[in-house]
């Protein structure tokens, strides 16, 4: 997260590191006692997910592994839409005070509405500097109209655009997969933006997780 | 330091095949995807195709669609471009190159190979 | 596929000459555009990004403008280190990334 603040702490249960190893990979949001979702471009073969804890490494927090993940079946690794994934934990999280599921969108929430996006990415870019506490930043939902003067035909319909005007907070390398949470919901996965990160006008890109709650909750009911 | 080191030249028969390594070292591998990019001798930059080293998920030049496969080693941090049934064409250097960006897209190349050449004759 | 002319192809100029290289597209790539040079035997070199933003480490007489399907690289005063190839290429509408076909400035 470029130009954020550091998260209150405990105030986001759902956030998940996924680890390759001990390195930061991307970020998920639990939804369920064994699902985490993410972004589809975060695939791997398979994943050490860490739940319950602001700090990254911390040893006192969860860590199950995962082995299957589930892609949104139109994700394109050329346009990037559907950038959503499912990951299956290996076993069920305990859930407590420290380990929630995020409430999953009911609608879809207007421009102009206020979020958080929230990772342990790089605050720092192009050289990169992680952070071992979780950063968050506050945006604002932006218009597909006006993202689309930014991002042109780049910016798909289920893609949702957040930031500040002329601010450089935003996303970099390691949010991928986060969420962003407007009114207590998840409304976005990370999914990209411009490089070197952080310039301003240029938001932040999400996947629109409104448009994914019927995939989401399907896949879960297939492959539990 | 941050760089990727690549395999000397081979010098290969018509029809035959060739695997060109890519070695990263000084960033996380992980991270960012690795482009090949083909300069036959005296002509201009081709672009051939990418893969991401963490997903291994690809995207190919449509001329070279079943004769190139691009892999990965996260173990090793390497790359490899294999280029099958050779043609005399395809005599070039061959460079690996970083894409600069995060999540889905990468926007530039902002780091290179030393180059590979290949060469292929009768 | 988006097709990226560059031109001229070749060049000669001077020490200290101001030099101009423009880059087409065939179609708006808003300004997702990047510059590279390469010298003979060498991998090429990062420039610019972006259409104009100048990458770490290069020396500010090169710059760079543009937007939609036209762009240039100007060099502001040209230094004997400057003579080499260079080539545009495009990352608005990918795959494929598409490069144009490289201008080599050469000493007059």
């Known amino acids: 997260i470029i130009d954020g603040y550091k998260c209150k702490e405990g105030s986001h249960p759902w956030q998940v590191a996924l680890l390759k190893g001990n390195q930061l990979h991307c970020g998920g949001v639990l939804v369920d006692k064994y699902w985490v979702l993410t972004a589809a471009h975060c695939k791997m073969g398979q994943y050490q997910v860490q739940l319950g804890s602001d700090k990254i490494g911390d040893q006192s927090a969860q860590k199950i592994k995962a082995t299957k993940s589930f892609r949104h079946p139109g994700y394109s690794t050329k346009t990037h839409v559907n950038d959503i994934m499912l990951v299956r934990l290996d076993e069920p999280v305990k859930m407590s005070s420290k380990v929630e599921a995020v409430q999953l969108p009911e609608h879809c929430e207007p421009p102009g509405t206020s979020c958080t996006v929230s990772g342990w990415g790089t605050t720092t870019s192009p050289d990169v500097t992680f952070p071992s506490d979780l950063m968050c930043s506050d945006v604002k939902l932006i218009s597909s109209r006006e993202c689309k003067k930014v991002y042109k035909d780049l910016l798909g319909k289920t893609m949702l655009c957040a930031g500040i005007p002329d601010s450089k907070t935003n996303t970099c390398n390691g949010d991928s997969g986060g969420p962003l949470v407007c009114n207590d919901t998840l409304q976005g996965l990370v999914s990209w933006g411009t490089y070197p990160c952080g310039q301003p006008n240029d938001p932040g890109v999400y996947t629109q997780v409104c448009k994914y709650k019927r995939w989401v909750m399907e896949t879960m009911k297939t492959h539990r | 330091q941050v760089q990727l080191v690549q395999s000397g030249a081979e010098v290969k028969k018509p029809g035959a095949s060739v695997k060109v390594s890519c070695k990263a070292s000084?960033?996380?591998?992980?991270?960012?995807?690795i482009h090949w990019v083909r300069q036959a001798p005296g002509q201009g930059l081709e672009w051939m195709g990418s893969?991401?080293?963490?997903?291994?998920?690809?995207n190919y030049a449509q001329k070279l669609q079943g004769r190139v496969t691009m892999t990965t080693d996260t173990s090793t941090s390497t790359a490899y471009m294999e280029l099958r049934s050779l043609r005399s064409d395809d005599t070039a250097v061959y460079y690996c190159?970083?894409?600069?960006?995060?999540?889905?897209?990468?926007?530039?190349?902002?780091?290179w190979g030393q180059g590979t050449m290949v060469t292929v004759s009768s | 596929d988006i097709q990226m002319t560059q031109s001229p192809s070749s060049l000669s100029a001077s020490v200290g000459d101001r030099v101009t290289i423009t880059c087409r597209a065939s179609?708006?790539?808003?300004?997702?555009l990047n510059w590279y040079q390469q010298k003979p035997g060498k991998a090429p070199k990062l420039l610019i990004y972006g259409a104009s933003s100048l990458q770490s480490g290069v020396p500010s007489r090169f710059s760079g403008s543009g937007s939609g399907t036209d762009f240039t690289l100007t060099i502001s005063s040209l230094q004997p280190e400057d003579f080499a190839t260079y080539y545009c290429d495009q990352r608005y509408s990918t795959p494929p990334i598409t490069f144009g076909g490289g201008t080599k400035v050469e000493i007059k």
């Open positions: 000084g960033y996380t591998f992980t991270s960012e995807g």
């Open positions: 179609q708006s790539i808003s300004s997702y």
């Open positions: 893969i991401s080293a963490s997903s291994g998920d690809t």
């Open positions: 190159a970083r894409g600069a960006g995060y999540g889905a897209r990468d926007w530039y190349f902002d780091l």
